[in-house]
Interface confidence: medium
């Protein structure tokens, strides 16, 4: 079941998925001047069995000017250098994504891919938040959000994270209004059935992580 909602927006914070649940789709997008090869896939799909998950299909881009020449999937070093690195608070290596059953790793880049990756998340996906450089985290609880199914609709749980400027006094919820405000995002659980596939496993993984989990930005 795809999550037909956006993860919550936290002022001065970004989020990242450390691993992708089976069923997640990643658009095969090419950078300007390039396009998908005619017979190429529109998406990569995270699929698998009980023991192993991987991305089905390969994204391939070709020059918009040429007709039949397909580009190799392995990125060139200069292509990889194009990706900006975001300086976050005390960066660290992400946990081994392969250790989470039913999940795929971050797919490796393909040649001439777009600078932004577009994912379509599924129920049970967890994303982790961290304050951007220059802001520090004030925790009220877990700094993650999970896509859940409630009353037949998907929604993301609200991460308990506030990012405050280094020189500022502590901010509390409601003191700063994000540029775009969520439209009635529910924050409390209701008594009806909530689907949280693999939530237990993901929470255990989250417990082993610090808040500093971001190294690469696809923007």
């Amino acid at each position: 079941e795809l999550c037909d909602d956006d993860p919550p927006e936290i002022p001065h914070a970004t989020f990242k998925a450390m691993a992708y649940k089976e069923g997640t789709m990643l658009n095969c997008e090419c950078k300007r001047g390039f396009r998908r090869i005619k017979s190429g896939s529109l998406y990569m799909l995270c699929t698998g069995n009980s023991s192993h998950s991987s991305w089905d299909n390969q994204c391939q881009c070709t020059s918009s000017a040429t007709r039949n020449t397909t580009k190799q999937v392995t990125p060139q070093p200069e292509e990889q250098k194009e990706r900006k690195t975001t300086e976050m608070q005390s960066p660290m290596q992400p946990v081994d994504q392969a250790s989470l059953p039913g999940h795929c790793r971050e797919p490796p880049p393909w040649e001439n891919e777009a600078t932004e990756r577009i994912y379509h998340f599924v129920v049970g996906q967890m994303v982790y938040y961290q304050c951007v450089q220059g802001y520090r985290a004030l925790h009220r609880g877990p700094a993650e959000s999970v896509c859940k199914m409630t009353h037949g609709k998907t929604r993301w749980t609200q991460p308990q994270l506030i990012c405050t400027g280094e020189m500022e006094t502590s901010q509390f919820p409601g003191e700063e209004k994000p540029q775009a405000s969520p439209e009635g995002r529910p924050e409390s659980e209701t008594s009806c059935l909530v689907t949280t596939t693999d939530f237990q496993i993901q929470t255990e993984m989250a417990a082993t992580m610090e808040t500093s989990i971001f190294t690469t930005e696809y923007q």
Partner: nanobody, 131 residues
Framework: EVQLVESGGGSVQAGGSLRLSCEAS?????????MGWFRQAPGKKEREFVG?????????SYADPVKDRFTISRDNAKSTVYLQMNNTKPEDTAVYYC??????????????????????WGQGTQVTVSS
Amino acid sequence: EVQLVESGGGSVQAGGSLRLSCEASGPTLFSSYGMGWFRQAPGKKEREFVGAISRYGTYTSYADPVKDRFTISRDNAKSTVYLQMNNTKPEDTAVYYCAAYTYSGSFYSTVKTHHDEYHYWGQGTQVTVSS
């Protein structure tokens, strides 16, 4: 690539309402794109941000001159985004453009407000508000 076609423009009296539509076509899911509306007033070079909506409609953002008068919505099943214009004013007269941007599932600002951040544009539809 996504193609965008606006419709619904026309003439309206000040204080009246108009609903613009923008239909997207292309091989990629419409929910891959954040959508925005911009306008270009007569004699102005810059396209002015009107409002934007995130890819599932969870977040919206509006320019100050149109806040509380204009509403953006989207129907992903129909690959269409709408701009409902209420209580129109003569200064709303402009060519209105629909635009789309892609953003990462890993890092993103949910709505984008600057025209340079948009990757795809429609041809525009004329809106004239007379006093």
